[in-house]
């Protein structure tokens, strides 16, 4: 049984842990940034809080070939209840308003830190 225990699938990650891990990943990105993140790619800005994880993923998923944010994209997909694909456009986005990926990641970090402090883990 002890040996078989290694094959058992771990239980679901608590939302607070998942959020903390996402925050840590964003901190890593912002602190380790040397050249312009994702070659200065632009993404849609967001103007609301409800459904924010999906909206953030919808913005970032349109950035391709940027390994620095691939982990963030995967982590955000864990918070979004539906499948997100490139080209989707949510009502949460500010139309005609794009910002640099680096700024978006920084802003997302700020927002998630607030949510964590307030105990809003979902």
């Amino acid at each position: 049984l002890t040996c078989l225990g290694g094959f058992a699938s771990p239980g679901p990650v608590p939302p607070s842990t998942a959020l903390r891990e996402l925050i840590e990943e964003l901190v890593n990105i912002t602190q380790n940034q040397k050249a312009p993140l994702c070659n200065g790619s632009m993404v849609w800005s967001i103007n609301l809080t409800a459904g924010m994880y999906c909206a953030a993923l919808e913005s970032l998923i349109n950035v391709s070939g940027c390994s620095a944010i691939e982990k963030t994209q995967r982590m955000l997909s864990g918070f979004c209840p539906h499948k997100v694909s490139a080209g989707q456009f949510s009502s949460l986005h500010v139309r005609d308003t794009k910002i640099e990926v680096a700024q978006f990641v920084k802003d997302l970090l700020l927002h998630l830190k607030k949510l964590f402090r307030e105990g809003q883990f979902n």
Epitope: I99, E100, L110
Partner: nanobody, 118 residues
């Protein structure tokens, strides 16, 4: 990059009203606490009013309570300051700024001059 552009300042008589606007761009405006600060001639910078990210809470300096109203429109990336019953001592350059209390997230506009004089 990040830009905060104030407008609406000008010359107004005591007792008059002005509405300042701040158009934000280059960052996720909706996720930031925002505020208005002012600097009167020969004086230091003081916070006039602050509004939380989704407008859930507001702060006003005692000197403007009951006269000034801060608001925001996240869909337009715009911050407002409605100033009523203006007094000579409200004369100052008014700055729009993020109000996160953290230098990492610190952004300021260039300011707009408000002059209250008869």
């Amino acid at each position: 990059g990040v830009q905060l552009l104030e407008s609406g300042g000008g010359l107004v008589q005591p007792g008059g009203s002005l509405r300042l606007s701040c158009a934000a761009s280059g960052f996720t405006f909706a996720w930031y606490d925002m505020g208005w600060a002012r600097q009167a001639p020969g004086k230091g910078l003081e916070w006039v009013s602050v509004i939380s990210d989704y407008g859930r809470g507001t702060y006003y300096a005692d000197s403007v309570k009951g006269r000034f109203t801060i608001s925001r429109d996240n869909s337009k990336n715009t911050l407002y300051l409605q100033m009523n019953s203006l007094r000579a001592e409200d004369t100052a350059v008014y700055y729009c700024a993020t109000a996160e209390g953290d230098d990492t997230f610190d952004y300021w506009g260039q300011g707009t001059l408000v002059t209250v004089s008869s």
